[in-house]
Interface confidence: low
């Protein structure tokens, strides 16, 4: 589709005569008829196959024709065509005399023709005008012409249709040859594909507008080059989405089980050596002179209550010294000078003679102890609480306050790793020394029976175009990680050529 443009510039008819030689009265009021048609070796009358146009009266006898393109478009004359420009043409230009205002052929005199010219030749599409001058016996016509493409048509033959656009279906202008020239930030055959943020990961990122980087499921970060670990992953990392690879010293499905309490918390004091003994449990080996679960207590030699029979202990630089009560002697007040006659048993204790009265023994009532029943029973002295539990006297009984990870009357039991029902989908839990083991029912596998083997969401290969399939453990659904050039929940649509709708 294009336009053949003809610009009339000057017509000379000095004598003011018709082609027949008859003078026009009062002068030749001149208008033109133009016929454009296919190339003919000899231009002959007949259908104007490429178009025809007529002008109004432009002047009398001799006159210059004004360029009137701005005021109504009469000059240059426009001969539009709706086909591929063939590159050749024939042109007939007739000058007619119109005595009155009616320019219809039947309203003109029978000899109204002033002049008739016919040319033919080759003409390429272009902006440049070709200047020509045709002279007959009595007249001369100067004119120029060219062929240009209509709006939205391009190419050597005006055959390429291109409508510039900037909307959801394309972002481009048209080059002179009709090829698309994408607007900044767009690419692809129809400039529908945005150019993502520089560095945006080809597979894991995409964009819907230029300089954007949107992440596919399982990826994050400004350039979508950081994987998202499994939901709930505490002390772990990933190299592909939904992984949870534990940092050193951590274990469990979510890397939330502390396997290195010693390193992470340094619980042992005063230079003691720490040994990990299971999840969140440890043992401190104290240096000489220290005691306590965490070796936090400095040892005093009197702490072991070496003095018997109510003797009081005094610390000394070189050890300790027992101050014995009346009737007792010896390093630890272990020898008695008393007999039952001296009523040595306190707190209602019964005295029994020994060695023919030379010695005695006290039988103490409940809650009292010592050689003379002088001590209230401290049920914690024997340190009955295991695994670093704290012993508490509660009247006639005692109680162990256990450290985290232990239970039982004497803190002798590890807290069952199975207590929180870690095995999914009805798996059976077994406590082991260093953790637990799940025995999974049919159809499930994994350390915690979390993998549905019989209904693996990826088993049906739902992802197209060689996309990678990931099973989301928490929802038993799949996520497709598309290769470059594809989008969609199953990577089923090419990015460059989505089902088109180019309005």
């Amino acid at each position: 589709s294009g336009v053949f443009q003809l610009q009339l510039q000057e017509f000379i008819n000095e004598r003011g005569v018709l082609a027949s030689g008859r003078p026009c009265e009062p002068g030749c009021r001149t208008f033109f008829r133009v016929c454009l048609k296919h190339f003919q070796a000899v231009v002959s009358p007949g259908p104007c196959t490429f178009g025809t146009v007529s002008t109004p009266v432009l002047g009398t006898n001799s006159f210059a024709v004004r360029d009137d393109s701005s005021g109504g478009g009469r000059n240059p004359l426009q001969l539009p065509f709706n086909f591929t420009w063939p590159g050749t043409f024939s042109l007939i230009i007739e000058a007619w005399h119109a005595p009155g205002d009616d320019l219809r052929p039947e309203a003109l005199p029978p000899d109204a023709l002033i002049s008739k010219i016919a040319i033919q030749g080759s003409l390429a599409v272009g902006q440049n005008w070709l200047l020509d001058e045709q002279t007959s016996t009595l007249t001369r016509l100067r004119y120029s012409y060219r062929v240009i493409c209509s709006d939205n048509y391009y190419g050597d033959n005006c055959s390429r249709l291109c409508k510039k656009r900037n909307d959801h279906f394309g972002h481009y202008v048209c080059q002179p040859d009709g090829n698309l020239s994408c607007l900044p930030g767009w690419t692809g055959e129809y400039c529908q594909q945005p150019i993502c943020l520089s560095g945006c990961h080809e597979q894991n990122g995409y964009c819907s507008k230029p300089a954007e980087c949107l992440c596919r499921p399982g990826w994050q970060g400004r350039l979508c080059n950081e994987c998202i670990p499994h939901n709930g992953c505490r002390h772990g990392t990933c190299s592909t989405p939904w992984q949870c690879t534990c940092d050193e010293g951590w274990g469990g499905l979510f890397c939330d089980q502390d396997l290195n309490y010693c390193t992470h918390h340094s619980p042992c004091k005063n230079g003691a050596t720490c040994s990990n003994s299971g999840q969140r449990s440890y043992t401190c080996t104290c240096r000489p002179g220290y005691t306590g679960v965490d070796c936090e207590l400095e040892l005093s030699e009197c702490d072991s209550n070496p003095c018997r029979n109510g003797g009081s202990c005094k610390d000394q630089e070189d050890g300790y010294h027992c101050l014995c009560p009346p009737g007792y002697y010896g390093l630890h007040c272990e020898h008695s000078t008393l007999s039952c006659a001296d009523s040595p048993c306190f707190n209602g204790g019964s005295c029994r003679e020994r060695n023919q009265g030379a010695n005695y023994a006290c039988e103490c009532p409940p809650n009292f102890t010592g050689s003379n029943c002088e001590k209230k029973v401290d049920r914690c002295t024997s340190n009955p609480c295991a695994n670093g539990g704290q012993c508490l006297n509660r009247g006639p009984s005692r109680m162990c306050r256990c450290r985290p990870g232990f239970t039982g009357t004497y803190c002798e039991l590890h807290v069952s790793d199975c207590a929180r029902n870690p095995c999914a989908h009805g798996g059976t839990c077994h406590d082991l020394e260093n953790g637990l083991m799940c025995t999974c029912p049919a159809g499930f596998s994994g350390r915690r029976c979390e993998v549905r083997t019989s209904i693996d969401a990826c088993a049906s290969s739902p992802c197209f175009n060689r996309a990678t399939c990931y099973t989301d453990l928490s929802t038993d659904t799949f996520v497709c990680n598309c290769p470059y050039g594809f989008v969609g929940s199953r990577c089923e649509f090419p990015v460059g050529l989505p089902p088109s709708f180019p309005w």
């Epitope: 709006d151 409508k163 909307d167 959801h168 649509f493 989505p498 089902p499 088109s500 709708f501 309005w503």
Partner: antibody, heavy 119, light 106 residues
Framework: EVQLVESGGGLVKSGGSLRLSCAAS????????MSWVRQAPGKGLEWVAI????????YSADSVKGRFTISRDNSKNTLYLQLNSLRAEDTAVYYC????????????WGQGTMVTVSS | SYELTQPPSVSVSPGQTASITCSAD??????VSWYQQKPGQSPVLVIY???KRPSGIPERFSGSNSGNTATLTISGTQTMDEADYLC?????????FGGGTKLTVL
Amino acid sequence: EVQLVESGGGLVKSGGSLRLSCAASGFTFRSHWMSWVRQAPGKGLEWVAIISYDGSNKYSADSVKGRFTISRDNSKNTLYLQLNSLRAEDTAVYYCAKAGGGNVGFDIWGQGTMVTVSS
Amino acid sequence: SYELTQPPSVSVSPGQTASITCSADKLGTKYVSWYQQKPGQSPVLVIYQDAKRPSGIPERFSGSNSGNTATLTISGTQTMDEADYLCQSWDRSDVVFGGGTKLTVL
């Protein structure tokens, strides 16, 4: 056979709601833009809404913005139009139409479903 | 807002050519489609991209579009062509329909 079948129309009071469905068959539904067009009795066609092949782009006429919602379920080959806050002027035959690939025209139309809003 | 203007009615004798226009500012820069709708029936696409015919549409239907006017031409009009004809184009993100032209074949 390529076919679009609308359903869900009926009589509803002003201010009420309806959900129209359009079941597609005979072509790859998930690959094409789809639209709803309505025609009030004795009037011309009025475009209502259009949705992209994957549902990511939706456009609607100003007259229904905020009241009507277009959606689709590609797994069911079904197009939907949720009509809320209905008015008397929404009374029309509602057509479901497929936008032909690569041109501006709607090349397949359903038989239409009548929605009547009484005041 | 962008409006497509059509004459309400056009009459033509059988066998003659009917031309139905659709006008809007710089319409020639846009694609125009034409639909035929008979009473009680759904619309049918007869012309798209200004001048292209879908398969099954007779050759007597043709179209053109330049400047501000698109034209649907039916040459050798038949009585079965009596119907409403609607033009349609696109303005930004909106689909725009003309008001429709009733073609009467006398």
